[in-house]
């Protein structure tokens, strides 16, 4: 009985959110001995790589030198060992950012709150979009989607010290084309009256030269980074 190989792991470096005209690399990690990797974009074959020597390589990279809205969308990859093909990878949502305008992000009742207070973020963009995304920086990044004609509300509810951190928002023109990021808003949450200790913020990667909302991928952190991507992409679908 013909079997399939385990699905490969797909991610984007340095990040799945790519400013237009910047470069991005799509990585596909399969097995040693794979003779061919195929990258599919929106269901169609997009690129092929045949690693040499296959027994020494378990990962290939597909380089996109100039990101634009035509390159934004859903990618997946498969690989082949001999005649046997793998299951397709999970879908990677590649997003082009820095399209058109910059939203403004604000927080109610203010950027410094007490644990238990009800906090709401507001993301506003006056151009034609009705979908907004709120992102919290950090390895365990949270992405929320909101809707509104020119503004979306993101109620966090009663916050805890785990909500501390830096937030940005984007306007979304479609699932894969986002605006410039808003200016960051840093939310400070102090403990309640019984517990005044402050929880540490989520660990964040060092900022790269494209702006701090992009996360760099460091050796040994690729899997974490890809999981970060995967978390965010689940919200896109």
């Amino acid at each position: 009985q013909q079997q399939t190989l385990p699905k490969p792991f797909i991610w984007a470096e340095p990040h799945f959110m790519v400013p237009k005209e910047k470069q991005v690399t799509i990585c596909c990690q399969g097995n040693y001995g794979a003779v061919e990797y195929q990258l599919h974009f929106e269901g169609s074959l997009f690129a092929v790589d045949r690693p040499k020597p296959p027994e020494r390589i378990n990962k290939v990279k597909f380089y996109i030198p100039d990101m634009n809205s035509r390159m934004a969308g859903q990618y997946s990859c498969i690989y082949r060992v001999g005649e046997l093909w793998s299951e397709p990878s999970n879908l990677l949502d590649l997003v082009v950012t820095e399209m058109y305008d910059t939203p403004t992000l604000s927080v109610h009742p203010g950027p410094e709150v007490i644990s238990g207070e009800k906090v709401t973020f507001y993301c506003r963009l006056d151009t034609a979009t009705s979908m907004f995304l709120l992102l919290k920086e950090g390895r365990s990044s949270h992405v929320q989607r909101g809707y509104g004609k020119v503004q979306a509300e993101f109620p966090l509810g009663p916050v805890t010290t785990a909500h501390r951190g830096t937030y940005r928002c984007f306007g979304s023109y479609n699932n894969h084309a986002w605006s410039f990021p808003s200016e960051p808003v840093k939310l400070l949450v102090t403990g309640d009256i019984e517990n005044t200790s402050l929880a540490p913020e989520d660990p964040t990667f060092p900022a790269d030269t494209w702006g701090t909302y992009l996360l760099t991928t460091e050796t040994g952190l690729q899997k974490d980074h890809a999981l970060w991507d995967h978390t965010a992409q689940n919200l896109l679908r």
Epitope: S106, V113, G116, R124, I193
Partner: antibody, heavy 117, light 107 residues
Amino acid sequence: QVQLQQPGAELVRPGASVRLSCKASGYTFTTYWMHWVKLRPGQGFEWIGEINPGNGGTNYNEKFKRKATLTVDKSSSTAYMQLSSLTSEDSAVYYCAIRLRFALDYWGQGTSVTVSS
Amino acid sequence: DIQMTQTTSSLSASLGDRVTISCRASQDVRNFLNWFQQKPDGTVKLLIYFTSRLHSGVPSRFSGSGSGTDYSLTISNLEQEDIATYFCQQGNTLPPTFGGGTKLEIK
């Protein structure tokens, strides 16, 4: 240091409108919501509403929705409150205030509005 | 809206006295209770936030306590400069609401 400057007094006719100002300095104007509060002698404070100077978003006390309109001018770091169709019930001291940390921690000096013919 | 009640509208005390001003909410405000001081010239200052936390620059003779619906402000050693009207305010739900005020006078 943080300052919220308000004019001392306004005398207006019944049925008219008045625009009160609050000039802010000493902090990032667009980051913090500006609140407006009414104080009538012997009646305690009433919260009128708040405006986000960064994007113009507002929250109003239902009681003042038809009475007050909040706006800002970012270029001059000034918040405004327009009160319309004034009656003697609107005679009061009106304060602007901001919450920099955990409560309304900075207040203007208040503008005394007298509605009289 | 949450109603805030300060049953004592005025209070006379001597310098050096310990004075307690109370405030009751119509429903639980989860400790999001603040106290303000309004001086005779109209100046308003925050004294206490989140029931018991002293705002920066406020003398330590001021303290706050309470939970649920019942809260109080205490001035442990009354001074001349404390002559003012004191207001409680809940910040648990919109709209924020204030008590009617307690006017403190010297005997």
